[in-house]
């Protein structure tokens, strides 16, 4: 069967099962109940589940049967739509259930909820999650599809099952080991981390489907492919970019079956014809099916083929310029895009796509102008500022980066971030400007070459997740307009943005800085971050004050949390100094 | 009516030198795929070499990269094929084609939209 082009079935839901196999369909299932209902309990999740699999094997046996030929939105809207609690829990999302399909799913899609109301995820002991790994592996691995899964209701779901593939070896192994938290730890640490940056890079993936557009997601898939496949033609990168956009087209929008079924179509296409598309991508074709996915989506650049002629010849000097837009405009940017993409590893791929903007609104112009050669002959002058910029701004902050280390380099990135949108809850302030500083240490030890395609597309990424925050509840108009008015410029629209005057600062309140014994015995991460939020709201409420008065004020209150944490009587010390730090702080900063 | 005239094939030996000319006729090379098939006595055809007529870039198949090298001249609209160190196994029938760049791959000749009669090239002592 090719690509996508499968027969015409009488029964999605059989269909499905069969190319998926049992278990796939199952945690594929529950992956999606739990991102469509994130407060349901598991068990209810499991319940469900394992009615859809009982339905879809009797498809299987009958495709003719009773509601086999229902599409997959129809039978899985339908079961959620039997929970009983579905209005005490969820409020208006109850509504979706009165709606027809499409309407219901895209209604269940719009309450998906980027920042649930769950609990924090703690971790047992490691004997205690031996001990349940080995009462019911099953149960044990369905509960973390289902954790993670509501927490993240854009994870990728072909790639969490990846990330159960390899939390269940982590346990078939740790729990046998001489030492289990010492093996185990580090892997779940390692998950975790890998997990938070895939369920964010994910997440860039659908807001750039859902708000900017196909066509948005194919440009941005046109330059990364070009660079990451620079020796394959444009017909292969435009296949595999219309490929690549059905995929996650169907993840983000709650089609989970559909889209690993054809992520896996994808890989063993991409396999087939590797000689075509890449030299770096024979030892993931080695691996089985997950793993050889999620080795394709992260392979390296292939090198780029030798003697690649000029761009200016073609797309500058040509007096046919005009004459090849006209004739296809979408076919000849997207040749421009490729074109530069492969020539350009070492650029970003929002920069890449700002160039082709820059590119398209300069042939927009010109073509219609009295000389249309005379006017776009100086157009790559115009990119050289837009290269420039994020150049600048990586060598700067990496220098900041390096002379601070990254719990520094994050706080000054609070202060700036703070003073820009100071209307931003502070935890989401926190977050974000968290992993904001996260860049340094991913990205300054790169070389020259490597550094703004890791800087930027990352902080593309981490920008998203205050855009997708900010819009669950809105508090800033310069947010908002960072966030919708261009996808690939919001990294530039955040850093253009100077202290906002218009902000009138928070009252003080004193209980905001009242600290107590617990903060001793949190994680060295905890404790940043309790500090971090604390720094947060120093700077609303002194927007004004100076980097110098805010050093001084951490400083203090780092020694005032190593003091009183050696204290004999922890929680008095924090009582009392904790009242004089309060002063002494309002003091430096004329609070 | 689109047209393609392949010219230039003939006999040569093993070691020696040709060069194939594609002129095309009702089409301009705007944004288009060129690119050069053969097909030997008995065997598929197959892709030889490509180039975008808009940024220029060129593929070849691994059998003649380093021997033959592709170019085109929109001005004339003329496709060009430079063969050096021919081999007999270059022997065959070899064939000029168009498509759209978002289509065309050299491994499948179907993604062409147009073809010439071809010219016959025969490596031989």
């Known amino acids: 069967r090719g690509v996508f082009r499968r027969d015409a079935h009488k029964s999605e839901v059989a269909h499905r099962f069969k190319d998926l196999g049992e278990e796939n369909f199952k945690a594929l299932v529950l992956i999606a109940f739990a991102q469509y209902l994130q407060q349901c309990p598991f068990e209810d999740h499991v319940k469900l589940v394992n009615e859809v699999t009982e339905f879809a094997k009797t498809c299987v046996a009958d495709e003719s049967a009773e509601n086999c030929d229902k599409s997959l939105h129809t039978l899985f809207g339908d079961k959620l739509c039997t929970v009983a609690t579905l209005r005490e829990t969820y409020g208006e999302m109850a509504d979706c259930c009165a709606k027809q399909e499409p309407e219901r799913n895209e209604c269940f899609l719009q309450h998906k909820d980027d920042n649930p109301n769950l609990p924090r995820l703690v971790r047992p002991e490691v004997d205690v999650m031996c001990t349940a790994f080995h009462d019911n592996e099953e149960t044990f691995l369905k509960k973390y599809l289902y954790e993670i899964a509501r927490r993240h209701p854009y994870f990728y779901a072909p790639e969490l099952l990846f990330f159960a593939k390899r939390y269940k070896a982590a346990f078939t192994e740790c729990c046998q080991a001489a030492d289990k938290a010492a093996c185990l730890l580090p892997k779940l640490d390692e998950l975790r981390d890998e997990g938070k940056a895939s369920s964010a890079k994910q997440r860039l993936k659908c807001a750039s489907l859902q708000k900017f557009g196909e066509r948005a997601f194919k440009a941005w898939a046109v330059a990364r492919l070009s660079q990451r496949f620079p020796k394959a033609e444009f017909a292969e990168v435009s296949k595999l970019v219309t490929d690549l956009t059905k995929v996650h087209t169907e993840c983000c929008h709650g089609d989970l079956l559909e889209c690993a079924d054809d992520r896996a179509d994808l890989a063993k296409y991409i396999c087939e014809n590797q000689d075509s598309i890449s030299s770096k991508l024979k030892e993931c074709c080695e691996k089985p099916l997950l793993e050889k996915s999620h080795c394709i989506a992260e392979v390296e650049n292939d090198e780029m083929p030798a003697d690649l002629p000029s761009l200016a010849a073609d797309f500058v000097e040509s007096k046919d310029v005009c004459k090849n837009y006209a004739e296809a405009k979408d076919v000849f940017l997207g040749m421009f895009l490729y074109e530069y993409a492969r020539r350009h590893p070492d650029y970003s791929v929002v920069l890449l796509l700002r160039l082709a903007k820059t590119y398209e609104t300069t042939l927009e112009k010109c073509c219609a102008a009295a000389d249309p050669h005379e006017c776009y002959a100086k157009v790559f002058d115009e990119f050289k500022p837009l290269v420039e910029e994020p150049q600048n701004l990586i060598k700067q902050n990496c220098e900041l980066f390096e002379q601070l280390g990254e719990y520094k380099f994050q706080n000054a990135l609070l202060v700036r971030y703070t003073k820009k949108v100071p209307q931003v809850s502070t935890p989401t302030l926190v977050e974000v400007s968290r992993n904001l500083g996260k860049v340094g240490s991913k990205c300054c030890k790169h070389p020259e070459a490597k550094r703004m395609p890791c800087a930027e597309d990352y902080l593309s990424v981490v920008l998203n997740q205050l855009c997708v925050l900010h819009e669950k509840t809105p508090v800033s108009d310069r947010v908002t307009k960072c966030c919708t008015e261009s996808l690939v410029n919001r990294r530039p629209c955040f850093s253009a943005l100077e202290v906002d005057e218009t902000y009138v600062p928070k009252e003080f309140n004193a209980e905001t800085f009242t600290f107590h014994a617990d903060i001793c015995t949190l994680s060295e991460k905890e404790r940043q971050i309790k500090k971090q939020t604390a720094l947060v709201e120093l700077v609303k409420h002194k927007p004004k004050a100076t980097k110098e008065q805010l050093k001084a004020v951490m400083d203090d209150f780092a020694a005032f949390v190593e003091k009183c944490c050696k204290a004999d009587d922890k929680e008095t010390c924090f009582a009392e100094e904790g009242k004089k730090l309060v002063a002494a702080s309002q003091a430096a900063l004329g609070l | 009516e689109v047209q393609l005239l392949e010219s230039g094939g003939g006999l040569v030996q093993p070691g020696g030198s040709l060069r194939l000319s594609c002129a095309a006729s009702?089409?301009?090379?705007?944004?288009?795929?060129m690119g050069w098939f053969r097909q030997a006595p008995g065997k598929e055809r197959e892709g030889v070499s490509s180039?975008?007529?808009?940024?220029?870039?060129?593929f070849y198949t691994n059998s003649v990269k380093g021997r033959f090298t592709i170019s085109r001249d929109n001005s004339k609209n003329t496709l060009y094929l430079q063969m050096n160190s021919l081999r007999a196994e270059d022997t065959a029938v070899y064939y000029c084609?168009?498509?759209?760049?978002?289509?065309?791959?050299?491994?499948?000749?179907?993604?062409?939209?147009?073809w010439g009669q071809g010219t016959l090239v025969t490596v031989s002592s």
């Open positions: 180039i975008y007529t808009v940024g220029g870039s060129t």
């Open positions: 084609a168009a498509g759209s760049p978002a289509r065309c791959r050299l491994r499948d000749p179907t993604t062409f939209d147009y």
């Open positions: 009702g089409f301009t090379f705007l944004t288009s795929c």
